[in-house]
């Protein structure tokens, strides 16, 4: 029989990205394995991950039910092979996470620029409404289908010949600016969800600049 | 088709090890767990523990933790249980029993046909 | 460890009848459940997994639910080749646990 060196796991992660959520926790196993569990404050400890020697577990599909509810988390440690627990009187050890309201500690995803159109001195800026794994009646819902007008997006605009920019914001998934004829301008946008106090705004989407493929002109 | 073919079966005298073996074939060896299950004459079934075949990491019930040694030979798609210091109590059927898919993950959803350990002075 | 009392411990009924076992949790173990039949001689076959779900090919005769930690097993029209014993089994919790069983024969 071996050494008793089951460890509790530490450094319990949650790691999401437009409702994308895995748990990671620390440390790498030796002679030990792991089970993940996850519970709504009022629910079941469900467990995933079973007798895993990886030190992460994916919980999109648990938490994606309902992305508005509370979730905790909970890492069991195991001995594996003839290694004895350190757990007392047969408890097994576990650690437990802090807890997770996707709604509000997911973060936004980097945005992409879909399309944007010139028609004279106005341009139709369209930002891509990215698919979540939110599903309601078997289809995937989109981020503002999840969010609606609780997610706003900044577009930032200048023109190719100079530096300075300029910002407006949607509660939509476009924008229709003014610019100067005969100018050539570049985009970015910005996810924001205005509501929040933490991960209120996305990375900065690729710049997208006219001239280029994405553009149509129109007199 | 999917199967497990376990060995014959053994006869042991009190304090000896028995080793069971499990051959796996009809899909990726490696992709499934594989668990331990007894069951004495007469009574219900015991989960003994599990082999994860890709690294060979074991899981044991605590009942049997120190007696019990699951090993796989993954050249063969095989599997093994050794278990030692026998006892008439251990006498039983031994089965091992594949972990199912993702979604099932611990339905044991193919069986080998069982091996019966006798143990008997 | 998690016990899984199953009841009754053995039942008998006619061809055609509704026959439903139970098995009860010790705690809370979410839909972590699966049922097994298991028939002289042989090794137990799945039958229901995650406490609802139909394994490949079993006859739609044999559903499972759940409420709490309250499980329940039914053949909805007992069928001569359903003489068995019946198992559930729970994988919420280290160790695997699995219910005492319940025999089912033809009066």
């Known amino acids: 029989s071996g050494t008793t060196n089951t460890v509790a796991a530490y450094n319990l992660t949650w790691k999401s990205t437009n409702f994308k959520t895995i748990l990671e926790w620390e440390p790498k196993p030796v002679n030990q394995v792991y089970t993940v569990q996850i519970s709504t404050k009022s629910g079941d400890w469900k467990s995933k991950c079973f007798y895993t020697t990886d030190t992460e577990c994916d919980l999109t599909d648990e938490i994606v039910k309902d992305v508005k509810q509370t979730y905790l988390a909970r890492v069991f440690s195991y001995p594996a092979g003839n290694v004895e627990s350190t757990g007392s009187a047969g408890e097994p050890l576990f650690t437990n996470a802090r807890k997770f309201l996707p709604y509000r500690d997911t973060k936004l995803g980097q945005p992409t620029i879909q399309s944007f159109e010139q028609v004279g001195t106005k341009v139709n800026v369209t930002v891509e409404d990215e698919r979540t794994l939110v599903r309601r009646n078997n289809t995937f819902l989109s981020l503002r289908d999840v969010f609606g007008k609780d997610l706003i997006y900044t577009l930032y605009y200048w023109k190719s010949s100079s530096s300075g920019k300029k910002t407006a914001k949607t509660n939509t998934n476009e924008f229709l600016i003014d610019v100067d004829k005969g100018e050539n301008y570049c985009f970015s946008v910005q996810a924001v969800i205005p509501s929040r106090t933490v991960n209120r705004k996305s990375t900065d989407s690729p710049v997208e600049c006219m001239g280029q493929e994405k553009g149509e002109f129109r007199e | 088709q999917v199967q497990l073919v376990q060995s014959g079966a053994e006869v042991k005298k009190p304090g000896a090890s028995v080793k069971v073996s499990c051959k796996a074939s009809g899909y990726t060896f490696a992709n499934y767990y594989m668990h331990w299950v007894r069951q004495a004459p007469g009574q219900g079934l015991e989960w003994m523990g599990i082999i994860n075949p890709s690294g060979g990491i074991t899981v044991y019930a605590q009942k049997f933790q120190g007696r019990v040694t699951m090993t796989r030979d993954t050249s063969t798609s095989t599997v093994y249980m050794e278990l030692s210091s026998l006892r008439s109590e251990d006498t039983a059927v031994y089965y091992c029993?594949?972990?199912?898919?993702?979604?099932?993950?611990?339905?044991?959803?193919?069986w080998g046909q069982g091996t019966m350990v006798t143990v008997s002075s | 460890d998690i016990q899984m009392t199953q009841s009754p411990s053995s039942l008998s009924a006619s061809v055609g009848d509704r026959v439903t076992i139970t098995c009860q949790a010790s705690?809370?173990?979410?839909?972590?459940l699966n049922w097994y039949q298991q028939k002289p001689g042989k090794a137990p076959k799945l039958l229901i997994y995650?406490?609802?779900n139909l394994e490949t090919g079993v006859p739609s005769r044999f559903s499972g639910s759940r409420s709490g930690t309250d499980f329940t097993f039914t053949i909805s029209s007992l069928q001569p080749e359903d003489i068995a014993t019946y198992y559930c089994?729970?994988?919420?919790?280290?160790?695997?646990?699995f219910g005492g069983g319940t025999k089912v024969e033809i009066k």
């Open positions: 089994q729970q994988y919420n919790f280290h160790p695997l646990t």
């Open positions: 995650d406490a609802s």
């Open positions: 705690q809370d173990i979410s839909n972590s």
């Open positions: 029993a594949r972990g199912g898919s993702k979604v099932a993950a611990l339905a044991f959803d193919i």
